[in-house]
């Protein structure tokens, strides 16, 4: 069971990143699915290595003082969502913006029907060029 | 099937990084090989988690305006190369240069005879000290 | 065999990071253990994907000129410790400090009784907020 999906620019104002089965994507079988273009949902309980990579372009003057934060989050059936992993990068002083990349990854127990998704502080800063931003998992 | 190889400084002007089976490297068996010091080639079709880490040292004034970009690339038999993953980091203002590290990783389907390699915008900026720059894969 | 442990602030002045089985941690069975809150120790020989993520907050003026370095290290029975992976990030000019995240990961052969741990140049700069700093492994 494995998946690797590709970032998709979205007109939605939500902080949850959108993904697509496009380009050189992976969706090994129907035991993992991409739901609503925003979350990877698994049918089988078990340990999964889950990862995300986010490239973004920001400028210190044009952004809030808070850093750019990417969060890997879990929504289990009947539970509130929770943060599994986070990474933070202070905005660049480069103009018009400076690119930076964040990588998150870890081993987590998922229940049947559990979904994982990626949240960022400012989706408008995310880079969607080939290979820059992606999200996936594999069952151990 | 798994491999982990270590960066090697190269006098070549190519943007493709060079690797070696040295230090604490891994080469599990002959189903994965390091070819020409530049690419990991697999004999078996299947899903692989492929990763690379690149540490580099650059300075904004001494570099081009474009960021430092590391790309994980795929060359399948009878196909042109393609980008699987990219990460970008804007150059530092630190002098003489500021170190930064990039990590790339994802799950991809590889065909028999497929090769993966790492491309960077400026190989002369890559750090080859112990543990700083490495490349590997594992078959799921 | 898999583990994922969560960073713990420590009053110790050691450069070795401290970890805990808290929050959404993973400890699959007793073939991997967290020893002294500082190292993951495995009972079985084999290939392991080992990873760490460290988020830190630093300022160029308040820090030494040397970059922030995170090292993934190995201590095998009867051997001196050795560096497996390192990542470096130059300090930010943001005030009071600028957050940055480092991710390390690779495939390594571990002997029975081998331990892996994470070393940083300045543990006081490490961010311990939810999900920011973690450490884990999985047996292939």
């Amino acid at each position: 069971i494995a998946a690797h999906v590709i970032s998709e620019a979205s007109s939605k104002t939500t902080s949850v990143l959108q993904w697509a089965e496009k380009g050189y994507y992976t969706m090994s079988n129907n035991l993992v699915t991409l739901e609503n273009g925003k979350q990877l949902t698994v049918k089988r309980q078990g340990l999964y290595y889950i990862y995300a990579q986010v490239t973004f372009c920001s400028n210190r003057e044009a952004s809030s003082q808070a850093p750019f934060i990417a969060s890997l989050c879990l929504k289990s059936p009947g539970r509130f969502e929770r943060i599994l992993l986070r990474a933070a990068n202070t905005h660049s002083s480069a103009k018009p913006c400076g690119q930076q990349s964040i990588h998150l990854g870890g081993v987590f127990e998922l229940q049947p029907g559990a979904s994982v998704f990626v949240n960022v502080t400012d989706p408008s800063q995310v880079s969607h060029g080939t290979g820059f931003t992606s999200f996936g998992l594999l069952k151990l | 099937i798994a491999a982990h190889v270590i960066s090697e400084a190269s006098s070549k002007t190519t943007s493709v990084l060079q690797w070696a089976e040295k230090g604490y490297y891994t080469m599990s068996n002959n189903l994965v090989t390091l070819e020409n010091g530049k690419q990991l080639t697999v004999k078996r079709q299947g899903l692989y988690y492929i990763y690379a880490q690149v540490t580099f040292c650059s300075n904004r004034e001494a570099s081009s305006q474009a960021p430092f970009i590391a790309s994980l690339c795929l060359k399948s038999p009878g196909r042109f190369e393609r980008i699987l993953l990219r990460a970008a980091n804007t150059h530092s203002s630190a002098k003489p240069c500021g170190q930064q590290s990039i990590h790339l990783g994802g799950v991809f389907e590889l065909q028999p005879g497929a090769s993966v390699f790492v491309n960077v915008t400026d190989p002369s900026q890559v750090s080859h000290g112990t543990g700083f720059t490495s490349f590997g894969l594992l078959k799921l | 065999i898999a583990a994922h442990v969560i960073s713990e602030a420590s009053s110790k002045t050691t450069s070795v990071l401290q970890w805990a089985e808290k929050g959404y941690y993973t400890m699959s069975n007793n073939l991997v253990t967290l020893e002294n809150g500082k190292q993951l120790t495995v009972k079985r020989q084999g290939l392991y994907y080992i990873y760490a993520q460290v988020t830190f907050c630093s300022n160029r003026e308040a820090s030494s000129q040397a970059p922030f370095i995170a090292s993934l290290c190995l201590k095998s029975p009867g051997r001196f410790e050795r560096i497996l992976l390192r990542a470096a990030n130059t300090h930010s000019s943001a005030k009071p400090c600028g957050q940055q995240s480092i991710h390390l990961g690779g495939v390594f052969e571990l002997q029975p009784g081998a331990s892996v741990f994470v070393n940083v140049t300045d543990p006081s700069q490490v961010s311990h907020g939810t999900g920011f700093t973690s450490f884990g492994l999985l047996k292939l």
Partner: nanobody, 123 residues
Framework: EVQLLESGGGLVQPGGSLRLSCAAS????????MIWVRQAPGKGLEWVSI????????YYADSVKGRFTISRDNSKNTLYLQMNSLRAEDTAVYYC????????????????WGQGTLVTVSS
């Protein structure tokens, strides 16, 4: 909308040099191989040179090997053809084209091309 705009053609003496450029837009340039083709007066299309998506592999027709060099700058979405030691038989309209798929063995497999730039080699 895919657009390819060639420039750099002109009149040059035998043995001279020219550098052609092709500015690309409307597609993800770095994902595609690119090709230069030419059409001499009264003749059919002839492929000249191909460059792979990342510029790591180049291919040349026998008639130009050793004299022409293809290159690309993915950061600028631009394709180039450096033409040295030009001969009268190189006189043609030169077109840049976008390769249609990822197979590296079909040298005529292109789907979009520009309006062309005329190269005349004459004394």
């Amino acid at each position: 909308e895919v657009q390819l705009l060639e420039s750099g053609g002109g009149l040059v003496q035998p043995g001279g040099s020219l550098r052609l450029s092709c500015a690309a837009s409307g597609f993800t340039f770095m994902e595609y191989a690119m090709i230069w083709v030419r059409q001499a007066p009264g003749k059919g299309l002839e492929w000249v040179s191909i460059i792979s998506p990342l510029g790591l592999s180049t291919y040349y027709a026998d008639s130009v090997k050793g004299r022409f060099t293809i290159s690309r700058d993915n950061s600028k979405n631009t394709l180039y053809l450096q033409m040295n030691s030009l001969r009268a038989e190189d006189t043609a309209v030169y077109y840049c084209a976008k390769y249609q798929d990822s197979s590296d063995s079909q040298y005529t497999n292109f789907d979009y091309w520009g309006q062309g730039t005329l190269v005349t080699v004459s004394s």
